[in-house]
Structure formats: C-alpha cells, structure tokens
C-alpha cells in the first residue's frame, strides 16, 4: 500500500502525515499582574495562568516566565485579547478647555522573540486611541493571525499600561498559539 | 509499511490520523431574534441561521435551539461577532450635568454548557462601555479562541441586551467553531 | 496496512489524509495605497504586500492585483484587521450645536469575488460610528471566520475610506487566509 | 405576546401639556426601545421620539423643544408629554416597541383632540 | 432628516392581481429599512423587515426587496385582505422617517 493513496496529488513527498491532537497548542488566561522591570522604551509583557481553569499548554508548547516557547518549527495560529478598564474620564481637558489635545491610547503587541536575532518582531498590534467622556470605561482589544515560527521562537504579550490591565475574569484577557 | 512512516517522530501512537474535511465544523450568521424567557441574572442567548446564505453545519456539528452541539471530544476555535447599534446618546446625562456617571455597556459571552456540570462556564467575553456622544451609534464585539471541549458540549452566544443587536446583514454578526 | 487503521471510524473513505505543511496560506502586510478607481457605491480595495517582512504566500495561495486567489476548495479560516486614523474631530457638530447628529463611520468588509457569479459576496463585516472628541483618533476593527470556498474563489478587502488606514506598520493592518 | 395600551385625556385645550402613558405588558420594558409615533386625522406616520430602558432618549429634532419621554421600569410604563399644543397637533397617538430595525409591536392608538 | 418617497401615492387593483409599490431614500441606509401595512382604524403592522425579511406570520405573497437607496414591495396575488395603507420607514438614522404612503384600493 502506497502512502499517496491517502494523500491528494499535490502533496509534497517530504511533508508527513501528523495527527492534529499532537499538535502544540496553549491558551493562558489572565492573572493578577506584578509589576516588574521593563526597558524603557518597551511596553512591559503580561504574565499568564497556564494549566488552571480554562488555561492549558500542551504537546511541548510550555510556557515560561511570561513566554509561550514554540517547539517545533511551522504555520501557527497566535491570538490574544486585553480587555483594558479605566477609572478617570480620559479628555475632560477637551470638555474643560474647550480645545482638543492629543488623546491617551491602550495599546497591546503580541512580540516574537528570537534568540539568534537581537531585536524583537512585532507580530500582531493594536492600539486604540482613549477620549471617553464617562469616567468608568472598559473595552477589549482582540488580535489574531497566523506566522510562519520557527522552533524555540518565544511569544509575548505587551501593553501600553499593565495597570489598565481587567485581571478579574479568565474569559476577558487570554492569549493563545496553536500550531497549523 | 508502518504508520511511523508518515508521523514525526514525536507523535502519539495512539493519536489517529484524520482527514480534515471530515472535521466538524460550523457557521451561523444572524437571524431576527424573537425574545425568550431567560434567568433573570444571565444574558439572554442568540438564536441563528445555520443553514442559508453563508451559514453551514457538517460533519455532525450540529445547530438546534440557540446551542451548537459538540460532536466530538477535542480542540476547537470557538469565535462569533456581534454589531451592537443604538439610537440614544448613552452619556447625555453626563454632558448636561457635567458630571460623569457609570456609562452603560455592551456585552457577548461565548458560553459552554456541560449537561454534567451544574454551571455554565463563560468561555469568553467582550465587553465595551458605551459613552456615546451621538445619537446614532453602532460597533462590532469580535471574540475567538481555542478551547479543550468534551462530546456533548453546548455552545450559545449571550448578549447584554437582545434589543440592541443588528441583524440586518449576516456578515455583521456571526458564530462558528471548528475543530482543530 | 489498511487506511482505516490511521482514521477514526466516522472518517469517511473518499476523504484523502493531507499533510498540513502542504495546505494554502497566505498572510499579508499593509502598504501605502495608491488610490484607484472604483464603482461608485463600492468600497475601494485595499492592496497588499505579500513576500517582505512578515508576509508570505504558500502553497498556491497566490496574491494578485489586490486578490487572494483560492486555489482549491475547502473550508479557510479568513481574517483581517484594518487600523483606521483620522485627523479631525469627527463630531465636532455635536459640541457646537448641542445636537446629535448621523456620526461618521469606519468600515471593513473581505469580499469574495466569484467569476461565474455577477455580484461580489461580503463574507465579513465590521463597522463601527466614530463619532471622537479629541482630534488624533485611532482604531482597529479586526474580523475572522471560517467558510466554505470553492478553487478559483477571490478574496479582497474593502475599505470605507482608504485615505483612513494606518499603513505605517505591518502589525497594524493585515490580511489572511489559511485553508483548514 | 407583547401587548401596549395608551391611556390619557383625548382632549387638551390649546397652549396646555398633552400627557399620555403607556402600559406594557406580556414582557419586561427592561430591553429594547419604547416609542412614541403620531398619526394626524387621515395623513401620514410622524415618529416623535423614544426612550430606552436606561432613560436615554431621542427626540425628532421638529419636536424636540416641547416633547418629553419617561420611563417607570417599576411599573413596566412610559409617558409622553408634549407641551405648547395647538390643533395641528391633533392626531391619534401610538405608542410602540422598537429595536435597532424595526417597530415591531403598536399600541391600539388613542385619539388626542387639541381644542378649547 | 433622511427623506422616504413612496410611489404611487394611490394604487386600483384587484384580486389576483401582481402589484408593486416603491420606496426611495433620499440618502443610502442600507437594509434599515420595512414596509407596514394599516387598516383603517387600526395600528400599522409590520410585514417586511430589513428590506426583505417576511415578519413571522405574513403570508409569503408579499415580498420586499432593494438595498441603499431604492426598495420594492410586491404583492404577489392580490387578496381582498389587502386592500390598506402600506407605509415604508427608515431606521437607519435618526430621526426615523416614514414614507406618505400609498393606498391600496379596489378596482
């Protein structure tokens, strides 16, 4: 029995059959953040739950000091969601004043890291800008898209203000990678 | 011929392989929706088209009153956009006090219920506050990760306020999920 | 060695086993537009980098005049998101008049163009009022979901205005398919 | 099914406030829009204005100085007054449910004389 | 304010019979747009929704179409029930405006 009877004609003899359930896959949910060090002029990186609740790693995807490190090479699937919360009515000097100025902004930036590479990429951003009028406001920013990674890549999640950041629920902010 | 030939080295002997269009999947876009008796603290859920225009269900994913049923244990992509629209300015009070106050919000939560499980588990939310300053105002909610489900899993999409959904076109507002 | 040893019992026989790498992916990149024609009542398209940076085409997925083509049927995931920017403050009325009136609006729409079909088919929509106080004003809208495509589908993304696209950096606005 | 019934005086003397209330029943007023529209003797529909559950409104800008919305969740009713009447006024008056597309459930109507 | 002109403004036709009446907007609104009809004495009904959606219970003779700008309702055949005032509306925005109507009348 042939292997290409399984297969379509396209398929390239080099590319092996794999069983989907063995593919690397995670999803980590949001935890109460510790404030820690971060370069200056780089966003500060979220850190996750990874094996309680909703949250799990497997088939050697792990997670580790705020990374997901990716463990073999191919086409991944990477998203993320922030839902950002704030507590002071963000234009009141435009209300005020009477003139505009420029707006503050929640930003989030799913980032790759390469060992062999000295600067980080940039994958996936988002950024909105913040002028809301009430002074309890709250929304989510959702990215996802699919990256070609290579193995021991790692994967972060930054934002523009940790302390922004809604810990509360498990279901509000998550990021997740799975392989292709 | 041994089934290793086709797998990498690291793959579960016991993980079949699987064709992938024999995966279950689905699409439901927006239909009218008719209000229904709900608990009093829980959203109301969505009902759907599953079968017209872009909506389809196959492979023993299957659509019946508002849930999506699970066929099969497994990693799904759960995902859904709801457009919320409204026709009040929903911070008025604020602009004439002059004084801020609780904005009101819109809300989607992806929802599984397990019939052995007393408790629905609330898989993912986005929720916005709506402080808008003119009268006519409309948004998209977009949720979408990937989640460990069992066969028998049922999903719905629960929504704020039913009211407030558009439902004019089936690209605006949507749910879907496939296995991995 | 029978097929079935490697299939789970529902699989069904005609559904041939494909290796993953060998599946058609694309994700693309912003650039700067360079305003075209366009019918009058459609939204212009958005063009696109497909092999610099982030960007790929693979496996016959291929890029041309500002379409993805499909190159064989199957079901794809399909996502994009657009960062939208604007320079005035687009409910100034509002303020001045102490009325509220119809607000602006960004839009997003992947539109699937069929040749033996006289109408394009709007897959995904996201659109969303701006109606911003401050005067530098920034927004994502971000779409994704899976259809049912057929070999030879064309895929584009629609804008309401292409004058409003962040086209500063490849994280920001993009553009992708793979087929699952 | 959801059922709305007006009620109020059907008749109001020139420069006076016209007041109606509307009662809803067989669902919570706690979602969706709650409108009022009016229909002078033999013409067309004029929509006046709505209300939702949370107390915002919106008003027809052509009547916007002299109408009023309230909502009364506790007692499952919202009131229309229109103050400054005169006898272009005159109209049968409805009171509705709305979501983002439709008007989907009317009152019966009830007529509004304005006339001294 | 968003214009709604409905034509004609009166209709004669009888049972059995194909008819079609016509809204336009004044400005594109997309599908926020129905068609009511009202019988004398009572309150409008809705019959078609988001331009061509049939409310539940509304027999399947009558059908809406159009998007933007123009829109069509169409009575199928004619049945003596039918003869009322049908109205097209807008909610795309405020405030939501009504057509003037067209009357439907027996030949």
């Known amino acids: 029995l042939k292997g290409q009877e399984f297969a379509p004609s396209h398929q390239q003899v080099y590319a092996p059959l794999r069983a989907d359930g063995d593919k690397p896959r995670a999803h980590l949910t949001v935890v109460r953040q510790t404030p820690t060090q971060h370069f200056k002029n780089q966003f500060p990186a979220l850190h996750w739950e990874h094996e309680l609740g909703l949250a799990f790693t497997k088939n050697r995807m792990n997670y580790t000091n705020k990374f997901l490190l990716i463990p073999e090479s191919g086409d991944y699937f990477i998203y993320s969601q922030v839902t950002f919360r704030g507590m002071t009515s963000e234009c009141s000097e435009i209300r005020q004043a009477g003139r505009p100025n420029k707006p503050d902004s929640i930003t989030v930036v799913i980032t790759k890291v390469t060992d062999s590479y000295p600067e980080p990429t940039q994958l996936l951003m988002g950024t909105k800008s913040v002028c809301e009028v009430g002074s309890n406001w709250f929304q989510p920013i959702y990215l996802g898209a699919m990256f070609s990674l290579q193995e021991g890549d790692k994967l972060m999640v930054n934002v523009s203000d940790i302390s922004l950041v809604d810990y509360t629920k498990e279901d509000k902010t998550f990021f997740g990678a799975f392989l292709l | 011929l041994k089934g290793q030939e086709f797998a990498p080295s690291h793959q579960q002997v016991y993980a079949p392989l699987r064709a992938d269009g024999d995966k279950p999947r689905a699409h439901l876009t927006v239909v009218r929706q008719t209000p229904t008796q709900h608990f009093k603290n829980q959203f109301p859920a969505l009902h759907w088209e599953h079968e017209l225009g872009l909506a389809f269900t196959k492979n023993r994913m299957n659509y019946t009153n508002k849930f999506l049923l699970i066929p099969e244990s497994g990693d799904y992509f759960i995902y859904s956009q709801v457009t919320f629209r409204g026709m009040t300015s929903e911070c008025s009070e604020i602009r004439q006090a002059g004084r801020p106050n609780k904005p009101d919000s819109i809300t989607v939560v992806i929802t599984k219920v397990t019939d052995s499980y007393p408790e629905p588990t609330q898989l993912l939310m986005g929720t916005k506050s709506v402080c808008e300053v003119g009268s006519n105002w409309f948004q998209p909610i977009y949720l979408g990760a990937m989640f460990s489900l069992q066969e028998g899993d049922k999903l719905m999409v629960n929504v704020s306020d039913i009211s407030l959904v558009d439902y004019t076109k089936e690209d605006k507002t949507f749910f879907g999920a496939f296995l991995l | 060695l029978k097929g079935q040893e490697f299939a789970p019992s529902h699989q069904q026989v005609y559904a041939p086993l494909r290796a993953d790498g060998d599946k058609p992916r694309a994700h693309l990149t912003v650039v700067r537009q360079t305003p075209t024609q366009h019918f009058k009542n459609q939204f212009p398209a958005l063009h696109w980098e497909h092999e610099l940076g982030l960007a790929f085409t693979k496996n016959r997925m291929n890029y041309t005049n500002k379409f993805l083509l499909i190159p064989e049927s199957g079901d794809y995931f399909i996502y994009s998101q657009v960062t939208f920017r604007g320079m005035t403050s687009e409910c100034s009325e509002i303020r001045q008049a102490g009325r509220p009136n119809k607000p602006d609006s960004i839009t997003v729409v992947i539109t699937k163009v069929t040749d033996s079909y006289p109408e394009p088919t709007q897959l995904l929509m996201g659109t969303k009022s701006v109606c911003e106080v401050g005067s530098n004003w920034f927004q994502p809208i971000y779409l994704g979901a899976m259809f049912s495509l057929q070999e030879g589908d064309k895929l584009m993304v629609n804008v309401s205005d292409i004058s409003l696209v962040d086209y500063t950096k490849e994280d920001k606005t993009f553009f992708g398919a793979f087929l699952l | 099914q959801v059922q709305l019934q007006e009620s109020g005086p059907g008749l109001v003397k020139p420069s006076e406030t016209l007041s109606l209330t509307c009662t809803v029943s067989g669902g919570s007023i706690s979602s969706y829009y709650w409108s009022w529209i009016r229909q002078p003797p033999g013409k067309g529909l004029e929509w006046i204005g709505l209300i939702y559950y949370s107390g915002s409104t919106n008003y027809n800008p052509s009547l916007k100085s002299r109408v009023t919305i309230s909502v009364d969740t506790s007692k499952n009713q919202f009131s229309l007054k229109l103050s400054s009447v005169t006898a272009a006024d005159t109209a049968v008056y409805y009171c509705?449910?709305?979501?983002?597309?439709?008007?989907?459930?009317w009152g019966q109507g009830t007529l509004v004389t304005v006339s001294s | 304010d968003i214009q709604m002109t409905q034509s004609p403004s009166s209709l004669s036709a009888s049972v059995g019979d194909r008819v079609t009446i016509t809204c336009r907007a004044s400005q594109t609104i997309s599908s926020y747009f129905n068609w009511y009809q009202q019988k004398a004495g009572e309150a409008p009904k809705l019959l078609i929704y988001a331009a061509s959606s049939l409310q539940s219970g509304v027999p399947s003779r009558f059908s809406g179409s159009g998007s933007g700008t123009d829109f069509t309702l169409t009575i199928s055949s004619l049945q003596p029930e039918d003869f009322a005032t049908y109205y097209c509306q807008q909610s795309y925005s405020t405030p939501i405006t009504f057509g003037q109507g067209t009357r439907l009348e027996i030949k």
């Open positions: 509705a449910r709305a979501d983002v597309v439709t008007i989907d459930y």
